[in-house]
């Protein structure tokens, strides 16, 4: 969480951002909140990116003002116009690219004063893993698949019964490049699985951590998945 205070002839206003991550090819949100003004037309929102000459986005007098917008963001940005009056300056970024990563500044001007806060935006790919029993294998085998990851993640298996056990010797992980030549499909196979146990396939890179659980008993199979973005720090 980054909290910035503006310094100007007028009062400073509090602006708060949260470091976040974007999933390439999908839409992302750069979070920013501020101390709002009573009148929408008195609020100016500017989003800037370090190393980029033009603006990422500008909202003023109640509408988008995109004449100074940098080419790389053309047609890809929007603020939540109906929530600006309640202090939401968050930016929606469409079709996140790897090159969108970097340091952004949320800069606010109101009749009370000015304020800004920086935001670290990471980009990559992350997806939920699915763990299934591989009935084609000769022995009891689990197969963990996640369609899109970047950068290349690590994969670790764990089990509820054998806590702390190292499964690297009885597992095999492969990374297959997807058609867009950036993201990769992750496939990990775990051998010699015993029933009445819960196994977890944990996939992690510097952006996200995802876990796929499977509980195998004689009568049923239960699955659960969970994905968590890392380093979501507020400023």
């Amino acid at each position: 969480l980054i909290i910035g205070f503006g310094i100007s002839g007028r009062h400073s206003i509090t602006v708060t951002t949260v470091a976040s991550a974007g999933n390439i090819g999908e839409d992302g949100i750069l979070s920013c909140t501020f101390e709002p003004d009573i009148k929408l037309s008195d609020i100016v929102i500017q989003w800037l990116k370090e190393g980029v000459l033009g603006l990422v986005h500008e909202f003023k007098e109640g509408k988008d003002e995109l004449s100074e917008q940098d080419e790389m963001f053309r047609g890809r940005t929007a603020v939540f116009a109906d929530q600006v009056i309640v202090g939401n300056a968050s930016l929606r970024l469409k079709n996140v690219q790897l090159t969108d990563a970097g340091t952004y500044k949320c800069y606010i001007i109101t009749s009370k004063g000015k304020g800004n806060a920086n935001l670290e935006y990471k980009t990559g790919a992350f997806s939920m893993p699915e763990v299934n029993v591989d009935y084609n294998a000769s022995s009891e085998t689990l197969r963990c698949e996640a369609p899109r990851w970047f950068p290349q993640p690590t994969v670790v298996w764990a089990s509820q019964v054998d806590q702390g056990a190292n499964f690297s010797e009885v597992s095999n992980t492969s990374f297959e490049l997807n058609s867009e030549n950036v993201t990769m499909k992750v496939v990990s196979v775990l051998y010699n699985v015993t029933i009445n146990n819960t196994y977890s396939c944990m996939i992690e890179n510097d952006i996200a951590k995802a876990t796929g659980d499977i509980k195998v008993t004689e009568s049923e199979i239960k699955r659960r998945s969970h994905l968590q973005l890392l380093n979501s720090k507020a400023s």
Epitope: P36, I38, K39, L40, G62, V84, V86, N88
Partner: antibody
């Protein structure tokens, strides 16, 4: 139809705290600001602040900062206001009121609750 | 803070009469950007909650009888009731929402003779 149901009257001792509630129905709770207004014989109507349940963002009148704290529970469509370190000056009727549906301002107040009487007395 | 002054503090009229009450602000409530006056009028009947009558100084809230009219601009505003009915017995408040914190006038109490 839009309804704002406030909690019942409170008799509290000086220095204590009180938490008032306002349950909303008949509209999308997370899409509108909820305001609290104080009405006392000596001071008339005074705006305390608002909360936007969609994000939890709040805005307070400087006069009530540190004394009033607003929260919202989306699951029950209820807004709360806690008043702390109460004195006899806080004896008043407190109203919750829903903000308007314009995107250019969160005012005026289009719907009001029935009010909660708070009496601060030893 | 913007100070709102209402006059008279009370008045008594007969049913059918025309009534005007005044509200003055310590600074202009007209916003040049959109030419709107950030002023509202509320009616509070005895033992009840306030109800919105007028916003943007002259826009009647849905369901409000057309005998209620708001007028004025800048710092001087008026609420007019063209033909008073017995049910109009109430206190009328003006409120500015031009700058934080929004503030109310002390009210005008309308009594029926």
């Amino acid at each position: 139809q839009v309804q704002l149901q406030e909690s019942g009257p409170e008799l509290v001792k000086p220095g204590a705290s009180v938490k008032l509630s306002c349950k909303a129905s008949g509209y999308s709770f997370t899409d509108y600001t909820m305001h609290w207004v104080k009405q006392s014989p000596g001071q008339g109507l005074e705006w305390i602040g608002w909360i936007y349940p969609g994000s939890g963002n709040t805005m307070y009148n400087d006069k009530f900062k540190g004394e009033a704290t607003m929260t919202a529970d989306k699951s029950s469509s209820t807004t709360y206001m806690q008043l702390s370190s109460l004195t006899s000056e806080d004896s008043a009727v407190y109203f919750c009121a829903r903000g308007g549906d314009s995107i250019i301002t969160v005012f005026p107040f289009t719907y009001w609750g029935q009010g909660t009487l708070v009496t601060v007395s030893a | 803070d913007i100070v709102m002054s209402q006059s008279p503090s009370s008045l008594a009229v007969s049913v059918g009469e025309k009534v005007t009450m005044s509200c003055k602000s310590s600074q202009s409530l007209l916003y040049s950007s959109n030419q709107k006056n950030y002023l509202a009028w509320y009616q509070q009947k005895p033992g009840q909650s306030p109800e919105l009558l007028i916003y943007w100084a002259s826009t009647r809230e849905s369901g409000v009888p057309d005998r209620f009219t708001g007028s004025g601009s800048g710092t001087d505003f008026t609420l007019t009731i063209s033909s008073v009915k017995a049910e109009d017995l109430a206190v009328y408040y003006c409120q500015q929402y031009y700058s934080y914190p929004p503030t109310f006038g002390a009210g005008t109490k309308l009594e029926i003779k």
